[in-house]
């Protein structure tokens, strides 16, 4: 699998997931958040080669079809896969609140 | 719907549904299948800008990061949503068969 | 149901030959594609070499030096291995896919070492 455990500990130039830090006030103009600062969101990146961990079966078509018109702008694209969610505490007046943030963090990635 | 209704009769820059034929024989290289002779894959293509038919959570927060971080390289990809079967008559021996191929068309397109 | 063996393979010394084949058996029919992948140890598998119908395409760091061949008749796949490089060393497995469905071989060493 294209996860964390493989791709952050190999050289893959083929998509693979990739370490990605976003500060919640930097990097989104968030400010009501309180905590964590930030969090590793990680993005996935890289060709998709044939077959490269392919999704579909369409996937698998337009993969040979590139192989075979390397000009062509029709590509399988690397996303994400499996995502996990992220705890955080914001406040509603004084009062806080912990929300569980669905689909927040890349854990592997594929091509789509 | 980022999808062929609204793609195929539009300017759209952004992420849709374009138009791509495939011919078997020529661009995949497939002489067994009879009929047909190709078909109308179609493919994904166009930027993904916040907020443009993001598929999850992670996306909108990608999308955002990207827009704050214009030189960044993690950024949404535009790719299929839903995907049509496609039904193909090639023999065995000199017996047609007819089958569904799963997930071979592409119908719509999302930001993931 | 399809079963792929492949065979040929060896240790070999870096500039040497191998030739793999693959055996083919049951009902081969509606082959999308046949093909040559490897797996070097900690990596994912990778393609090396596939074939359609009339079709041939190659991984980049093999171009020049491999060559896959099919025989439709006997339900075969080769692969000629020349020029060997010390990064070819990994298991090659044989593929092929049918209708949408992905058949494997066991695979089979190939090491290039002095």
């Known amino acids: 699998a294209l996860d964390t455990n493989y791709c952050f500990s190999s050289t893959e130039k083929n998509c693979c997931v990739r370490q990605l830090y976003i500060d919640f006030r930097k990097d989104l103009g968030w400010k009501w958040i309180h905590e964590p600062k930030g969090y590793h969101a990680n993005f996935c990146l890289g060709p998709c080669p044939y077959i490269w961990s392919l999704d579909t079966q369409y996937s698998k078509v337009l993969a040979l079809y590139n192989q075979h018109n390397p000009g062509a702008s029709a590509a399988p694209c690397c996303v994400p896969q499996a995502l996990e969610p992220l705890p955080i505490v914001y406040y509603v007046g004084r009062k806080p609140k912990v929300e569980q943030l669905s689909n927040m963090i890349v854990r592997s990635c594929k091509c789509s | 719907a980022l999808d062929t209704n609204y793609c195929f009769s539009s300017t759209e820059k952004n992420c849709c549904v374009r138009q791509l034929y495939i011919d078997f024989r020529k661009d995949l290289g497939w002489k067994w299948i009879h009929e047909p002779k190709g078909y109308h894959a179609n493919f994904c293509l166009g930027p993904c800008p916040y907020i443009w038919s993001l598929d999850t959570q992670y996306s909108k927060v990608l999308a955002l990061y990207n827009q704050h971080n214009p030189g960044a390289s993690a950024a949404p990809c535009c790719v299929p949503q839903a995907l049509e079967p496609l039904p193909i008559v090639y023999y065995v021996g000199r017996k047609p068969k007819v089958e569904q191929l799963s997930n071979m068309i592409v119908r719509s397109c999302k930001c993931s | 149901q399809v079963q792929l063996v492949e065979s040929g393979g060896g240790l070999v010394q870096p500039g040497g030959s191998l030739r793999l084949s693959c055996a083919a058996s049951?009902?081969?029919?509606?082959?999308?594609?046949m093909g040559w992948f490897r797996q070097a140890p900690g990596k994912q598998r990778e393609m090396v070499a596939i074939?359609?119908?009339?079709?041939?395409s190659y991984v980049d760091s093999v171009k020049g030096r491999f060559t896959i061949s099919r025989d439709n008749a006997k339900n075969t796949l080769a692969l000629q291995m020349n020029s060997l490089k010390p990064e070819d060393t990994a298991v090659y497995f044989c593929?092929?896919?049918?209708?949408?469905?992905?058949?494997w071989g066991p695979g089979t060493q190939v090491t290039v070492s002095s």
């Open positions: 074939s359609t119908d009339d079709r041939t």
């Open positions: 049951g009902s081969i029919f509606g082959v999308f594609y």
């Open positions: 593929n092929l896919n049918q209708l949408g469905t992905d058949y």
